[in-house]
Amino acid sequence: MGRARDAILDALENLTAEELKKFKLKLLSVPLREAAGRIPRGALLSMDALDLTDKLVSFYLETYGAELTANVLRDMGLQEMAGQLQAATHQ
């Protein structure tokens, strides 16, 4: 436990301020698996990488939180970062 959380945090901390902002906006509309809720917009937009990691893990749990983070990174054109995140999660 904790490996996925660390991988999410590592990915988010490697985003520029502009990319982190874009990540949050995409997270608001990313397709979710059935029955998954959405993090409220108000809470999301002011978060830094650490707060956002904690929110993703508490809201979606580690495994799906990491998968969702990777998908948003892919939507942003950051496939390499997404792959690194998933590789770190599945070590």
Epitope: K26, S29, N71, R74, Q79
Partner: antibody, heavy 114, light 107 residues
């Protein structure tokens, strides 16, 4: 409808270089298509931050750059051979999810011939 | 690199027929597959993204389905203007890759 502007044709000699341009925004991809063949992704560049990704197959011959002031993406193709005669498309990814190429330029036809 | 295999390579058909085009990825690409239509001497045009999302303005006779490694583009009733090359592509991993294409021709 976004229009990606590309020049129509370029005639270059073997061993020479050519610099192709594309007025675009966001992530801009470059795609090669030889006559009667499929599509090959060369690489892409993010116009807002200059971040690039390359297909290793093209890394030695293609250099992707951007001029933010004119919202223009460039690819410089060097040491050209007849195998590089093709149509080169630029394309944008503007759809928010799944990163498809939703806008395509009309393509620049590059002919390598002495 | 992820290899995208399209089949059949070509299809001869009559107007009004139902057509199924297939695309297989060499590894799991989730839903990160798009379908493009390309007419002679024209640029490719996006039809379907995210495996099943129809792009703006695309007629509803075009339907995408599948996930992971197996993907399908269905044209329920082919029109004359649908005769073209169709390419699938994945955006799950770099390098982005495309299939070799399927050509739809008139019988």
């Amino acid at each position: 409808q976004v229009q990606l502007q590309q020049p129509g044709t370029e005639l270059v000699k073997p061993g020479a270089s050519v610099k192709l341009s594309c007025r675009a925004s966001g992530w801009t991809h470059w795609v090669k298509q030889r006559p009667g063949q499929g599509l090959e992704w060369i690489g892409n560049i993010n116009l807002s931050n200059g971040r690039t990704n390359y297909n290793e197959k093209f890394r030695a011959m293609a250099t992707l750059t951007v001029d933010k002031s004119s919202s223009t993406a460039y690819t410089q193709l060097s040491s050209l051979t007849s195998e590089d005669s093709a149509v080169y498309y630029c394309a944008n990814s503007m759809v928010p999810h799944f990163f498809p190429m939703d806008y395509w330029g009309q393509g620049t036809s590059v002919t390598v011939s002495s | 690199n992820i290899v995208m295999t399209q089949y059949p390579k070509s299809m001869s058909l009559s107007i009004g027929e139902r057509v199924t085009l297939r695309c297989k990825a060499s590894e799991n690409v989730g839903s990160y597959v798009s379908w493009y239509q390309q007419k002679p001497e024209q640029s490719p045009k996006l039809l379907i993204y995210g495996a099943s999302n129809r792009y703006t303005g695309v007629p509803d006779r075009f339907t995408g389905s599948g996930s992971a490694t197996d993907f399908i583009l269905t044209i329920t009733s082919v029109q004359a203007e649908d005769l073209a090359d169709y390419h699938c592509g994945q955006s799950y991993n770099y390098p982005l890759t495309f299939g070799a294409g399927t050509k739809l021709e008139l019988k």
